[in-house]
């Protein structure tokens, strides 16, 4: 089981939208996959994916989850608030027949205040 996550760094303006993507690859077929997003070490949500369907569509404040078979999990934050700033990690686990866990690399999300005098460039950096 492996998890690839992106982007590494995401900088967005307050009130806009942020999208975090996670790709889950498993060598053998699974009946039920448990996925999880954490922010700063605390769990935001941890639904199951069964038959290509998510058991939950929400994930933390203003967070929406989607699953695109066979392997893409997306967390969309909309609208983004200053409180969304932090370190996000995507996890995946297969619990049957034996536990197998994997985690992605951190996505650091920076949220700029909605202040027109601060005209910073948006940054989105994906791994390799």
């Amino acid at each position: 089981l492996s998890v690839q996550q992106g982007p590494n760094l995401l900088q967005v303006r307050q009130g806009s939208q942020a999208t975090l993507v996670c790709q889950v690859d498993q060598a053998t077929a699974w009946e039920r996959l448990r996925v999880k997003w954490t922010k700063d070490g605390a769990i935001l949500c941890q639904p199951y994916i069964t038959n290509g369907s998510l058991s939950l569509g929400v994930c933390g404040p203003q967070g929406r989850l989607s699953w695109q078979a066979p392997s893409h999990l997306t967390l969309q934050l909309d609208p983004v608030s200053l409180n969304h700033s932090g370190a996000y990690v995507c996890w995946a686990a297969v619990e049957i027949p034996e536990l197998e866990e994997a985690e992605g690399n951190i996505t650091r999300l920076f949220v700029d205040p909605d202040d027109p005098t601060q005209n910073r460039n948006r940054i989105a950096s994906f791994p390799g």
Partner: antibody, heavy 118, light 107 residues
Framework: EVQLQQSGPELVKPGTLVNISCKAS????????INWVKQRPGQGLEWIGW????????NYNEKFKGKATLTADKSSSTAYMQLSSLTSENSAVYFC???????????WGQGTTLTVSS | DIQMTQTTSSLSASLGDRVTISCRAS??????LNWYQQKPDGTVKLLIY???RLHSGVPSRFSGSGSGTDYSLTISNLEQEDIATYFC?????????FGGGTKLEIK
């Protein structure tokens, strides 16, 4: 501070049912699994099952299927375990416990003593 | 189901001693082994997860080791507050199972 506060001791008659509650505080209730564990006097611990309050999904130890029913109320941040068709074998201390970031129980309730006696 | 065996059900030691509590699984559990402490008043706390990772707030005198089917919990310098019963738990395979416990007492 994370806390799991369980309901008080129960003395019930054989053949009846009981509901044990576990009120969570200090964290987002819908984000973490709540597990239930049985401890008979002077014995080890037995895992009963878990509920994920976020979507209501459950997973039971086969041994407790048909005996235990796990539910959760998001509005009150409370998990419940109903035990039915009670016998003396069900007399035990029952714990609720939160599963942490990974596969371990990082916070436990204080336990609820159930006595089944006629 | 995987059976977890703690062969020593009770153990006596002196304050300051190094104490080792063992746990054996009926099959390989690939380090998915946790340790819990239950105080005489019934309070249960997580000590160690994934064989050797110390849970936050747990004193560093506690440590864990092992692999395959054999695991151990070591208390390097026994203190009065360590008097409790210790349980191992495997989470490699459902249903998750616990050992029978090792009760630690003061000599």
């Amino acid at each position: 501070e994370v806390q799991l506060q369980q309901s008080g001791p129960e003395l019930v008659k054989p053949g009846t049912l009981v509901n044990i509650s576990c009120k969570a505080s200090g964290y987002t209730f819908t984000s973490y699994d709540i597990n239930w564990v049985k401890q008979r006097p002077g014995q080890g611990l037995e895992w009963i099952g878990w509920i994920y309050p976020g979507d209501g999904s459950t997973n039971y130890n086969e041994k407790f299927k048909g005996k235990a029913t796990l539910t959760a109320d998001k509005s009150s941040s409370t998990a419940y375990m109903q035990l039915s068709s009670l016998t003396s074998e069900n007399s035990a201390v029952y714990f609720c416990a939160r599963r942490g970031l990974r596969y371990y129980f990082d916070y436990w309730g204080q336990g609820t003593t159930l006595t089944v006696s006629s | 189901d995987i059976q977890m065996t703690q062969t020593t059900s009770s153990l006596s030691a002196s304050l300051g001693d190094r104490v080792t509590i063992s746990c054996r699984a009926s099959q390989d559990i690939r380090n998915y082994l946790n340790w819990y402490q239950q105080k005489p008043d019934g309070t249960v706390k997580l000590l160690i997860y994934y064989t050797s990772r110390l849970h936050s707030g747990v004193p560093s005198r506690f440590s864990g080791s092992g692999s395959g089917t054999d695991y151990s919990l070591t208390i390097s310098n026994l203190e009065q507050e360590d008097i409790a019963t210790y349980f191992c738990q495997q989470v490699n395979t459902l249903p998750w199972t616990f050992g029978g416990g090792t009760k630690l007492e003061i000599k």
